[in-house]
C-alpha cells in the first residue's frame, strides 16, 4: 500500500538558518525517509531541495540554499521507502517575511559601580537575511542581581551601552533581544549573561561635567573629590555609538586637555567641527585611575552661545552703511553659524543717551536721516531665527563713526 | 597644515625586504588612523590595511593578511609599510593617506616600489 | 568583503554636460561611511564626497553625493576641463575598506 505523506510540515526561519520540521505518519517507521523538492517563482519544474534528502529523521537544514529572501518559495515533500509517498506541498513562504531576529552576540565588561555592554547583530557579519539592516537594529534587555527576582527593563538601546549606578563586587545577570522597527519584527531574547562588578575604585569619576563658552572658547568643567589629581578628557562622534564595531569607534583625546591638574579645561572651538560629540573624564592620581565619568552630550550648534557680529561702518553725509560680517573666534577665525540669524542694531549720537533700535535680516543695513558731521554708535547682536535654538548673542564692543558733511557726495 | 610625506621610491630585487614610510605632521597623529593604499601599474586603488597609532589597533583588508606588516612610531609621528620578501608582483605606487569620519582626507604623493631582477 | 562595482567603466563627454557616476555595493553600507574621490595621472586621489553627500573642503558644488544602501550616485552638473579624471567610490562602514574599479570619465 501506498506510504502516507509526512504531517504538520513547519518552516522556520531565524537569521540565515533555514530550519524543516515535520511529523512522521503512523505507519512511516522503520526504513522510511523524506525528501523535499522546492520551486522558485517563474519556474515551472520542482529542484531537489540540497540538505533535505533521503533523511532519517523529521528535521532539516537547507541553509546552504541561496535564495532571494523576497522571492515566495514553494515546498513539497514526500515519504519513500520501497515505494513512495504522493508529493505534500507545504504552504509557501518569503524568506524575509518568515524571518524571526535571532539573539544578538553580547559581551560585558565589569566597572565598580558599571556595566558596559557590547552589542553586535544577529546573524553573522556577511548575513544575507539582515544585509539592509544591520545598522538599523535596536535592542531591549532585562537585567537583575543575581540574588534577586527584581528585573529591570530597558529599552531602545544601542549597540554600546553602559549601565550605572550598580553596586561594587554584586553580581548582576541580564538578557538581550533585538528588533527592528522598521519590519515591525521583534527578535527573541538571547541566553543570560553575568557578570560581577569589580571592587570599589580607589578614585570615583568626575561627576557633574558641563561645558560653557568663556571668552570665545570653549570650557569644559566638573567636579572631583580629592585634590592633587590630573585629568584628561577624550571624545567621540556621537553617531558611532551605534556602531561600536566599526573602526572608527576611537576615544580621542583633547589636546588641551590631557594631563590638566585643574577641574577645567579651556580648547579653542575649532577643535570641533558642526556636530554632536561625547565627552568624558578620567581622573588620575599618579599610580591610580578612575573609570571614565559618564558621558555628556556636546553639540557645537546648541551649546556653544551665538557669538556677537562684527560690522564694518561706512560713514555718508545723512547716514551710516553697516556691513556685518562673521564673528570671529579668539584665533581670529571666522565662526560658520550657518542658521538664519537676525541682527538688532542699536545707535545714538554720541552726546545722547536716546538709543534707536533696527531689526533686520540682511548683513547689509543703512541708518538713513541722521545729521551731518556728528559722531553715532553702534552696538549690534544677534538673534537666532531657529525654533530649536532660540539664543541671542551679547551686544557687540561699541563702534562711533562721524558723519560726512552735508555737501559729501555719494 | 595637515601633511603626509612619504619616503622615496625604491627599486629592488624579488625576495629582498623594505620598509617604506609616511611622516605625518599639522595635527594630532595618534587621533587619526593611517591607511596603506596599493595602485599597481595601470589599475585602481587597493586598500591594504589600516593603523590607529593612539593604541596600535592594526586591521588588515583580507587579501595582504601576511603579505606585508603595518607599523607606527608616533613618538616621530610615523606609519611605516613593510615587506619580508618582495616578489615582482608588489610593484606598485604606494600611498598612505590619513584616515577618519570623512574618508581618507589627506594623502602622501606615493612611494613608487620597482621589484625586478 | 564588501564589492563595490562601479558603472560605467568609461564614460565620454564634453564639457558643460552633466555627469552621472554609479556604485553597487554587494550589501548594504551606512551611507556615513561611504565616499567619493578623483584622480588624475600621475597624482594622488583627492577625496572629494565623504558621507555619502558631505562635499570635503574646496570642492565645487557642482560636485553632489547620493544614495543609501546599496546603491550611490555621484553627479556632476556642469563639466569642466579639470573633470576629466578616475573616480572611485569607496567604503569605510567595514575595516576591510574597499574601493571601486573606477569609472574613467573621458572627454568626447
Known amino acids: 500500500k501506498n506510504l502516507k505523506s509526512p504531517q504538520k510540515v513547519e518552516v522556520d526561519v531565524i537569521d540565515d538558518n533555514f530550519i524543516l520540521r515535520w511529523n512522521r505518519s503512523e505507519e512511516s517507521v522503520g526504513n522510511v525517509t523524506f525528501s523535499f523538492d522546492y520551486q522558485k517563482p517563474e519556474m515551472d519544474n520542482w529542484i531537489k531541495l540540497p540538505g533535505c534528502q533521503n533523511m532519517t529523521s523529521t528535521k532539516c537544514n537547507f541553509s546552504s540554499l541561496k535564495l532571494n529572501i523576497y522571492d515566495e518559495i514553494k515546498l513539497r515533500i514526500r515519504a519513500e521507502k520501497e515505494n513512495t509517498s504522493s508529493w505534500c506541498e507545504v504552504d509557501s513562504f518569503t524568506p524575509f517575511r518568515k524571518a524571526q531576529i535571532g539573539p544578538p552576540e553580547v559581551h560585558l565588561e565589569a566597572e565598580d559601580k558599571a556595566i558596559v555592554i557590547y552589542i553586535s547583530p544577529p546573524g553573522t557579519e556577511d548575513s544575507v537575511m539582515w544585509a539592509l539592516d544591520r545598522s538599523s537594529f535596536t535592542y531591549s534587555l532585562v537585567i537583575w542581581k543575581n540574588s534577586s527576582s527584581v528585573e529591570e527593563r530597558i529599552e531602545n538601546i544601542y549597540s554600546r551601552h553602559k549601565i550605572s549606578k550598580l553596586s561594587p563586587e554584586t553580581t548582576y545577570c541580564l538578557k538581550v533581544k533585538a528588533a527592528l522597527l522598521t519590519s515591525r519584527k521583534i527578535g527573541v531574547y538571547g541566553p543570560v549573561h553575568c557578570i560581577k562588578t569589580t571592587v570599589e575604585n580607589e578614585l570615583p569619576p568626575p561627576e557633574n561635567i558641563e561645558v560653557i563658552v568663556q571668552n570665545q572658547n570653549y570650557v569644559l568643567k566638573w567636579d572631583y573629590t580629592y585634590a592633587n589629581m590630573t585629568f584628561q578628557v577624550q571624545w567621540l562622534h556621537a553617531f558611532l555609538k551605534r556602531k561600536p564595531g566599526n573602526h572608527l569607534y576611537k576615544w580621542k583625546q583633547i589636546p588641551d586637555c590631557e594631563n590638566v591638574t585643574t577641574t577645567q579645561c579651556v580648547f579653542p572651538p575649532n577643535t570641533f567641527q558642526k556636530g554632536i560629540y561625547l565627552l568624558r573624564v578620567q581622573a588620575s592620581d599618579g599610580n591610580n585611575t578612575s573609570f571614565w565619568s559618564e558621558e555628556i552630550k556636546f553639540d557645537t550648534e546648541i551649546q556653544a552661545s551665538l557669538l556677537p557680529p562684527v560690522f564694518n561702518i561706512r560713514s555718508l553725509s545723512d547716514s551710516l552703511h553697516i556691513s556685518i560680517g562673521a564673528p570671529k573666534w579668539s584665533e581670529n577665525k571666522p565662526v560658520i553659524q550657518d542658521y538664519p540669524l537676525i541682527y538688532e542694531i542699536l545707535f545714538w549720537e554720541n552726546t545722547s543717551k536716546a538709543e534707536r533700535k533696527i531689526i533686520k535680516k540682511k548683513t547689509d543695513v543703512t541708518i538713513p536721516n541722521l545729521k551731518p558731521l556728528t559722531v553715532y554708535c553702534v552696538k549690534a547682536r544677534a538673534h537666532s531665527m531657529d525654533e530649536k535654538l532660540n539664543k541671542s548673542s551679547v551686544f557687540s564692543d561699541v563702534v562711533c563713526e562721524e558723519t560726512k558733511s552735508g555737501n559729501t557726495s555719494k | 597644515e595637515v601633511q603626509l610625506v612619504q619616503s622615496g621610491a625604491e627599486v629592488k630585487k624579488p625576495g629582498e625586504s623594505l620598509k617604506i614610510s609616511c611622516k605625518g605632521s599639522?595635527?594630532?597623529?595618534?587621533?587619526?588612523?593611517i591607511a596603506w593604499v596599493r595602485q599597481m601599474p595601470g589599475k585602481g586603488l587597493e586598500s591594504m590595511g589600516i593603523i590607529y597609532p593612539g593604541d596600535s589597533d592594526i586591521r588588515y583588508s583580507p587579501s595582504f593578511q601576511g603579505q606585508v606588516t603595518i607599523s607606527a612610531d608616533k613618538s616621530i609621528t610615523t606609519a611605516y609599510l613593510q615587506w619580508s620578501s618582495l616578489k615582482a608582483s608588489d610593484t606598485a605606487m604606494y600611498y598612505c593617506?590619513?584616515?577618519?569620519?570623512?574618508?581618507?582626507?589627506?594623502w602622501g604623493r606615493g612611494t613608487l616600489v620597482t621589484v625586478s631582477s | 568583503e564588501i564589492v563595490l562595482t562601479q558603472s560605467p567603466g568609461t564614460l565620454s563627454l564634453s564639457p558643460g554636460e552633466r555627469a552621472t557616476l554609479s556604485c553597487r555595493a554587494s550589501?548594504?553600507?551606512?551611507?556615513?561611511?561611504f565616499a567619493w574621490y578623483q584622480q588624475k595621472p600621475g597624482q594622488a586621489p583627492r577625496l572629494l564626497i565623504y558621507?555619502?553627500?558631505s562635499r570635503a573642503t574646496g570642492i565645487p558644488d557642482r560636485l553632489s553625493g547620493s544614495g543609501s544602501g546599496t546603491d550611490f550616485t555621484l553627479t556632476i552638473t556642469r563639466l569642466e576641463p579639470e573633470d576629466f579624471a578616475v573616480y572611485y567610490c569607496q567604503q569605510y562602514d567595514s575595516s576591510a575598506i574597499t574601493f571601486g574599479q573606477g569609472t574613467r570619465l573621458e572627454i568626447k
Open positions: 599639522g595635527y594630532i597623529f595618534t587621533n587619526y588612523w
Open positions: 593617506a590619513r584616515h577618519d569620519i570623512e574618508g581618507f582626507d589627506y
Open positions: 550589501q548594504s553600507v551606512s551611507s556615513s561611511f
Open positions: 558621507g555619502a553627500s
